[in-house]
């Protein structure tokens, strides 16, 4: 807290300008009127106030707006945003995408702070859904943003927003998140032709079911091994050797290097050894010839 002291003669601020950077903290407190500050917030970010001076300016705004700042002030916070706590931000009502962009710009190049996370949460909740423009903005600043959302939160993403998603935005998504995103992507890209469709859907395939993988295997897509390794194990297991061969095309040779890793390892255990031998890759661990395979899961479903 800055002590209340009288403003020295001739130092009362008539406007927010560069001369204020030479004011000590107590002088800013005593000589800058909070209402003046609020109406001239657009000037604050053009003046290189120090971190400590910003404390005083924040204190003044807090006194003026105890219930939370209006958007006209929030929009121009600039570096003052770095001084805000999540508790401060929870009092705000941010509706403009321009305001969101302006505040994210201040934090650019840094990891997502609790303040930014709270701001985004307030903004998205206020909008009711994660629309394309918002998603475009958020993933531009934070490529990992999408994967930081829970499956429940992701369910509010409309399929049209999926067009804004870049492959790198999904790098840190887990299978539960891809399970939610994949059907949306499938819907979003449904009118594209085969090869274009595969390029777009590829990074979402970690959420694809078996039947979709079977369908892709009929389209000469030549899936790379990196994508294959991210597929759901339960979706890969029912695929036949022929289907995997068609799905991977020339990349099928890469299975050998991955034979000890999931989902390849588990898939090999489910295939007949003589089917695996047809690939000519030396894959071992399949079901020996003459053995009968019982699908117990099917038996349980029938009983």
């Amino acid at each position: 807290e800055v002590e209340k002291t009288a403003c020295p003669s001739g130092k009362k601020a008539r406007e927010i300008d560069e001369s204020l950077i030479f004011y000590k903290k107590w002088e800013l407190e005593a000589c800058v009127d909070a209402a003046l500050l609020a109406t001239q917030m657009d000037r604050v970010n053009a003046i290189p106030f120090t971190y400590e001076q910003l404390d005083v300016l924040k204190h003044k705004l807090d006194e003026l707006y105890p219930q939370g700042y209006p958007e006209s002030v929030i929009q121009h916070l600039g570096y003052l945003f770095l001084k805000m706590s999540p508790e401060d931000i929870r009092k705000w009502n941010v509706t403009s995408l321009e305001t969101l962009k302006a505040l994210l710009e201040v934090n650019k190049g840094h990891e997502m702070s609790p303040q930014v996370a709270t701001l985004i949460d307030r903004f998205v909740k206020g909008r009711g859904q994660l629309d394309k423009d918002t998603l475009d903005t958020l993933t531009a600043f934070y490529p990992g943003y999408l994967c930081s959302l829970s499956p429940e939160e992701l369910s509010s993403v409309p399929p049209s927003s999926i067009w804004a998603v870049r492959p790198q935005d999904l790098d840190t998504c887990d299978p539960r998140q891809l399970d939610v995103l994949y059907p949306k992507a499938r819907l979003a890209f449904q009118n594209m032709n085969g090869s274009e469709y595969f390029v777009k859907i590829q990074s979402f395939l970690g959420g694809a079911p078996t039947e979709d993988l079977k369908a892709l295997s009929q389209q000469n897509v030549s899936m790379d091994l990196a994508t294959f390794m991210k597929l759901r194990t339960d979706a890969v297991l029912p695929l036949t050797v022929a289907e995997v061969q068609k799905l991977l095309g020339p990349h099928v040779e890469g299975l050998k290097a991955e034979e000890r890793h999931r989902p390849v390892r588990d898939w090999i255990l489910r295939q007949r050894q003589d089917d695996l031998d047809t690939l000519g890759l030396g894959l071992q661990g399949g079901i020996p010839n003459g053995y009968l395979v019982l699908d117990l899961s099917m038996q349980e479903a029938l009983s």
Epitope: F22, A46, Y51
Partner: antibody
Framework: QVQLVQSGAEVKKPGASVKVSCKAS????????MHWVRQAPGQGLEWMGM????????IYYEKFQGRVTMTVDKSISTAYMELSRLRSDDTAVYYC?????????????WGQGTLVTVSS | DIVMTQSPDSLAVSLGERATINCKAS??????VAWYQQKPGQSPKLLIY???TRHTGVPDRFTGSGSGTDFTLTISSLQAEDVAVYFC?????????FGAGTKLEIK
């Protein structure tokens, strides 16, 4: 990488003016305040002021007000510091420097310095 | 203006030994203090900011500490390449001010 390359040494007579240049590269010139700091022989460092290349806003330390002029030429990413009515105690190495985060005014990058000698 | 008083003016320390440089601010500056290293004929280089945060690429033998008015730069095990003049700077308020410097030499 960020580079600030300054003009060469100058010898001036008392009462004259000197103009030192600082050519920036490796970053967006208009993004950061350009500061000027001087160092008299064997002495500490003294902050003189700053200019924002995007807005041409200048902020001068009171001690130099009226004698210093900071300008920029955006087209060639160059900042200038002119000091007039030179005195012998203005003999110093003059540095340009940039601060990446204005709220944390620590000097992240410096020019190599320009020695200005004021002597009759 | 905030005056930064550095001590000692010069310091001679044996290789591998600890070197300690102090800086005192005339007013409370919180942790808004930076330290610079200046080798002969070169411009200063940022070592520490926020009183204790090492700048990118600075060896961990350099440590900053302190808050309020008293600050310390410590070099835990002096190396030959550490011979230089060291300056503190406050950035709590303008004008930005520096200490007069401490010349560090090898004993």
């Amino acid at each position: 990488q960020v580079q600030l390359v300054q003009s060469g040494a100058e010898v001036k007579k008392p009462g004259a003016s000197v103009k030192v240049s600082c050519k920036a590269s490796g970053y967006t010139f208009t993004s950061y305040w350009m500061h000027w700091v001087r160092q008299a022989p064997g002495q500490g460092l003294e902050w003189m002021g700053m200019i924002h290349p995007n807005s041409d806003n200048t902020i001068y330390y009171e001690k130099f007000q009226g004698r210093v002029t900071m300008t920029v030429d955006k087209s060639i990413s160059t900042a200038y510091m002119e000091l007039s009515r030179l005195r012998s105690d203005d003999t110093a190495v003059y540095y340009c420097a940039i601060i990446i985060t204005p709220v944390v005014p620590k000097f992240d990058y410096w020019g190599q310095g320009t020695l200005v000698t004021v002597s009759s | 203006d905030i005056v930064m008083t550095q001590s000692p003016d010069s310091l001679a320390v044996s290789l591998g030994e600890r070197a300690t440089i102090n800086c005192k601010a005339s007013h409370d500056v919180g942790t808004s203090v930076a330290w610079y290293q200046q080798k002969p004929g070169q411009s200063p280089k940022l070592l520490i900011y926020w009183a204790s945060t090492r700048h990118t690429g600075v060896p961990d033998r350099f440590t900053g500490s302190g808050s309020g008015t008293d600050f310390t730069l410590t070099i835990s095990s002096l190396q030959a390449e550490d011979v230089a003049v060291y300056f503190c700077q406050q950035y709590s308020s303008y004008p930005l001010t520096f200490g007069a410097g401490t010349k560090l030499e090898i004993k």
